[in-house]
Amino acid sequence: KTLVLGKEGESAELPCESSQKKITVFTWKFSDQRKILGQHGKGVLIRGGSPSQFDRFDSKKGAWEKGSFPLIINKLKMEDSQTYICELENRKEEVELWVFKVTANSDTHLLQGQSLTLTLESPPGSSPSVQCRSPRGKNIQGGKTLSVSQLELQDSGTWTCTVLQNQKKVEFKIDIVVLAFQKASSIVYKKEGEQVEFSFPLAFTVEKLTGSGELWWQAERASSSKSWITFDLKNKEVSVKRVTQDPKLQMGKKLPLHLTLPQALPQYAGSGNLTLALEAKTGKLHQEVNLVVMRATQLQKNLTCEVWGPTSPKLMLSLKLENKEAKVSKREKAVWVLNPEAGMWQCLLSDSGQVLLESNIKVLPTWSTPVQP
């Protein structure tokens, strides 16, 4: 008995070969002897029933001259899994067709962190093994269900599942979209008074996207977090529902999600969490955003540089006179110089020598007041 493996919804070709390599009479039947189709000597394909019943069954007329009389079954269904009989040259050939199906749990669009379950449906009597390969090359294998917990952004793309049965294999390709922001977290460094822009690009494109979102902000100076803005999303259209009076944020009216804070102030320094709830999805998308604000000031004989917001302990804060060595450098959030000499002073926030933020302040001779450029 010949075994043919097929995929639900696709086509399968069941072989039937003549030893004489020429056109001959043949008939394809179900195992209960019901006729499917055949050729009775006039080179014409005769179907065994009404067109609606047998429109999925066909043969390759072009192959008949070479002594090949395959049965083509289109739009395969699970119930097509059975034995088919080819009668030709006074002999019967049995061909077993097994139709398989691999599906993703409920939806192929899943939120980051959710689980993906791939399920194999197979005909009774079969004992296939299945192995699936993720877009980032990770292999998982198992029985009829395979699970991946904690989906990551790199899991977006085409998953390839190979079903193996009696040394024959059939390959399934399933497109999985992991719904997430491009970045889990971002940090913005600004001098006091500068305009701040927060961007929240999505890592996927969906034709119709509906949801609602909110930005909660925990200022370093505040005891509790505060909702800064709420908005709705419909396709690429963003509409603000509610915004705080202080700060007066502005939001872009189309994707990608984008917010503008008129100016960076110490009282705004801190961390925010933007959540986006998508229609018909359980759970939310999250992106963390951090704001670090720097201020350089001179009060009487004291030149001070301060930063507010979530800085890592390894960041260095320095005060230096332009083109000279740093006068003071500390892994702290405030540094100062007493009786600074006149000139252009620079306050620098740096990470392993790389400057993240810089603020200049001009110190005038002692009889004048400072000028901030």
Epitope: Q195, K234, K236, Q250, G252, K253, K254, H258, T260
Partner: antibody, heavy 118, light 107 residues
């Protein structure tokens, strides 16, 4: 071919009311943001109002807030601008405009003239 | 509201000249900026979206650039049919705001 045709303009006294209409054809009207933009004689373009086809949300310029109302009838493929408490400075050519998929005003009507004068 | 400042307000140029018009936003608007051309007595014509994306049917001598607050419309070689008034529009947020316009006249 996408077409927009404004109507309803005319001469009206200060404090009076007027309703402008914009008849749309050649596209799926309900899918798009529609807007009104005006231009006073010898002046530049001035955005007046927009309405979303998807959400029905409406947006108005501060200068017309509380006096003008934008609305749409998707079954009739028509956009409206109800103008009340009209002032001299509302005298302008009023254009109806359609947004594209990227939310830019890509197609404009020929305009209808509104004159506010006593 | 976001203010759009266009400059110059008018300019005189000859056919074949390279013309540059600038538009400055009072705050960052990423690249959410459009350019329009208007001839006397006519409706505005959409030229450029997303600061630099040329609309179909618009000649390639028109180009746009910029991001954030500063934007430019350039006509590489001015043609007789290009004499018109040009407007920038910020499409970042409502209220939508136009620049005051730049009139390109024949020298």
């Amino acid at each position: 071919e996408v077409q927009l045709l404004e109507s309803g303009g005319g001469l009206v006294q200060p404090g009076g009311s007027l309703r402008l209409s914009c008849s749309a054809s050649g596209f799926t009207f309900s899918d798009y943001v529609m807007s009104w933009v005006r231009q006073a004689p010898g002046k530049g373009l001035d955005w007046v109002s927009s309405i979303s086809g998807l959400t029905g949300n409406t947006y108005h310029a501060d200068s017309v807030k509380g006096r003008f109302t934008i609305s749409r009838d998707n079954s009739k493929n028509t956009l409206y601008l109800q103008m009340s408490s009209l002032r001299d400075e509302d005298t302008a050519v009023y254009y109806c405009a359609k947004d594209n998929e990227d939310y830019y005003m890509d197609v404009w009507g020929k305009g209808t003239t509104v004159t506010v004068s006593s | 509201a976001i203010q759009m400042t266009q400059s110059p307000s008018s300019l005189s140029a000859s056919v074949g000249d390279r013309v540059t018009i600038t538009c400055r936003a009072s705050q960052g608007i990423r690249n959410d900026l459009g350019w329009y051309q208007q001839k006397p007595g006519k409706a505005p014509k959409f030229l450029i979206s997303a600061a630099s994306s040329l609309q179909s049917g618009v000649p390639s001598r028109f180009s746009g650039s910029g991001y954030g607050t500063d934007f430019t419309l350039t006509i590489s070689s001015l043609q007789p049919e290009d004499f018109a008034t040009y407007y920038c529009l910020q499409d970042y947020t409502y209220p939508r705001t136009f620049g005051q316009g730049t009139k390109v006249e024949i020298k």
